[in-house]
């Protein structure tokens, strides 16, 4: 991983990079390598494409071995017919203050999202729009015999419910989390990302997790039964250890992977969950990375194009662990 005194390059000649991928010097200034692209794993030795404004985001300072290529100047957002730069804040209406972050818009309510539970003083609370005011306000429907300032004595109707969905509420924060993007690699270790404001200060942040749709070395077509065209979730023979840039997972995992088809369809994760995985590196360092674990796969004709640079953003979003609303990854 680290730059040693003497340069050692994998090949004498410069590698041939795919179209649109820059040939750059590695982080040690030794060898010419193909620059890593948006969402790919990067290290000191494997730098991100500087010509596309990418940098290697290592996350926490303690985790300076492996990062993810991230855009310095993120993708703009189109919202309500207007284009906003990444990082730009705007008011979508009198009720919401929004921010663009890497192509995703997140909004924080300017009006109080407070919930009011019934009480003797306010037996039937409800929010109403008052003339000339942007934000709705609480009013308390009261019985006719109510005194001017004392509490109400009327019974509360059990069938009434009040306020927005409690699972999506945090004080004055409209919790928004995008689906996880598709894995950046169709086989082997890749990256999946999402944008959320499900954090203490309701700030938009980009989260990433490792993902492996299937191992590259597995010849899954062999396992397709006669007369069948697909193998959706092949059985894994034995528990596996994950590898990440020379580091190996501490535990073994009986992970599910997605299979393949012989009829032109592709199989991708459908329901997933996110769990932390500890990797041990040759120098003894332990690092923890969140990783996607597949619950179910789906086979379909909605396959990514070979050269679709937007595939990881728009293609086959994954379901199943939209913001764990009470955990922070």
């Amino acid at each position: 991983q680290d730059c040693s005194a003497q340069c050692q390059c994998a090949a004498e000649a410069a590698p041939h990079c795919p179209a649109g991928v820059s040939l750059v010097l590695d982080g040690c200034g030794c060898c010419r390598v193909c620059a890593k692209q948006l969402g790919e794993l990067c290290t000191e030795r494997d730098p991100c494409d500087p010509h596309k404004g990418l940098f290697c985001d290592f996350g926490s300072p303690a985790n300076r071995k492996i990062g993810v290529c991230t855009a310095k100047d993120g993708a703009p957002c189109v919202f309500g017919g207007s284009v906003y730069r990444s990082g730009e804040s705007f008011q979508s209406s009198c009720k919401y203050q929004c921010t663009c972050l890497d192509g995703a818009v997140g909004c924080v309510p300017l009006c109080s999202m407070d919930v009011r539970l019934p009480s003797p003083d306010c037996p039937f609370p409800r929010r109403v729009k008052l003339p000339g005011k942007c934000c709705e306000e609480w009013v308390c429907d009261e019985p006719k015999d109510r005194t001017a300032v004392g509490p109400a004595l009327a019974a509360y109707r059990l069938e009434d419910t009040f306020g927005p969905d409690p699972t999506m509420m945090r004080a004055n924060c409209l919790v928004q989390t995008t689906e996880w993007s598709a894995c950046s690699k169709t086989c082997g270790m890749g990256i999946s990302t999402r944008v959320t404001n499900d954090n203490t200060f309701c700030r938009l942040e980009k989260q990433s997790r490792l993902c492996m749709v299937r191992p590259c070395e597995a010849d899954l077509e062999e396992n397709i039964k006669k007369g069948k065209k697909c193998i959706r979730t092949p059985k894994i023979a034995k528990p596996v250890k994950f590898e990440l840039s020379g580091c190996t997972s501490v535990k073994t995992y009986r992970a599910k992977f997605c299979g393949v088809c012989t009829d032109g369809r592709c199989c991708t994760p459908h329901r997933t969950t996110t769990l932390p995985v500890e990797f041990k590196c040759p120098d003894g360092e332990i690092m923890k990375k969140n990783m996607m674990f597949i619950k179910t796969c789906a086979c379909h004709y909605n396959c990514p194009g070979d050269n679709d640079i937007f595939e990881s953003l728009y293609y086959r979003k994954m379901y199943g662990d939209m913001a764990h609303h009470h955990h922070h990854h």
């Epitope: 109080s112 407070d114 919930v115 009011r116 539970l117 019934p118 009480s119 003797p120 003083d121 306010c122 037996p123 609370p125 306000e137 609480w138 308390c140 005194t147 001017a148 300032v149 004392g150 509490p151 004595l153 009327a154 019974a155 509360y156 109707r157 059990l158 004080a171 004055n172």
Partner: antibody
């Protein structure tokens, strides 16, 4: 963000008057009432009184003669006054928002001792 | 003097179901008592869980439910989690004043 914060003296002499202030933010005192509750050391909660959103008050009958609760809506403050304090009034005093007692202050511990 | 009574302590295993009750000394609890349930975890502030008999606060998980059960107010926890270990107080409204119960210390085994 909804918050309530109690403030006042930590030590009061017997027969003196205790005055506590509850400063609220994140909601209006014209929309929500505020309750006062106390918890003596090692014991349960005891409801003391409330000032409703429209200014009316209700008190625990046991404290009626000693208690006054008022508010300054523009300052977002509720003032709690208890006269003729006694060592048995030693407790942590809390203010809490009406509507399910949903939000509480952290409490202020008051010791009554000479 | 009106007395509100709760179980002093209850013990439950993780994943289990437990019901805490709140009894009034002057008769059956009704919706006019606006039963409230308040939680205090060790070292944390009090916070309301349920108001108006059965309405959950925004932060109250769906595994907590408030109801009236056999003339008492009840708080039922289904699929109990270790983090539910806490002191639980009920409060009932009696036309001019609230009365708090003595509290239930809920212990989650394991």
């Amino acid at each position: 963000e909804v918050t309530l914060k109690e403030s006042g003296p930590v030590l009061v002499k017997p027969t003196e008057t205790l005055t506590l202030t509850c400063t609220v933010s994140g909601f209006s005192l014209s929309t929500f009432g505020v309750h006062w509750i106390r918890q003596p050391p090692g014991k349960g909660l005891e409801w003391l009184g409330v000032i409703w959103r429209r200014g009316g008050t209700d008190y625990n009958a046991a404290f009626m003669s000693r208690l006054t609760i008022s508010k300054d809506t523009s300052k977002s403050q509720v003032v709690f006054t208890m006269t003729n304090m006694d060592p048995v009034d030693t407790a942590t005093y809390y203010c809490a928002r009406d509507g399910g007692f949903d939000y509480w202050g952290q409490g202020t511990t008051v010791t009554v001792s000479s | 003097e009106t007395v509100v009574t709760q179980e002093p302590s209850l013990t439950v295993s993780p994943g289990g179901t437990v019901t805490l009750t709140c009894r009034s000394s002057i008769g059956a609890v009704t919706t006019s008592n606006y039963a409230n349930w308040v939680q205090q975890k060790p070292g944390q502030a009090f916070r309301g869980l349920i108001g108006g008999t059965s309405n959950r606060a925004p932060w109250t998980p769906a595994r907590f439910s408030g109801s009236l059960l056999g003339g008492k107010a009840a708080l039922t926890l289904s699929g109990v989690q270790p983090e539910d270990e806490a002191e639980y107080y009920c409060a009932l409204w009696y036309s001019t004043h609230y009365v708090f119960g003595g509290g239930t210390k809920l212990t989650v085994l394991g």
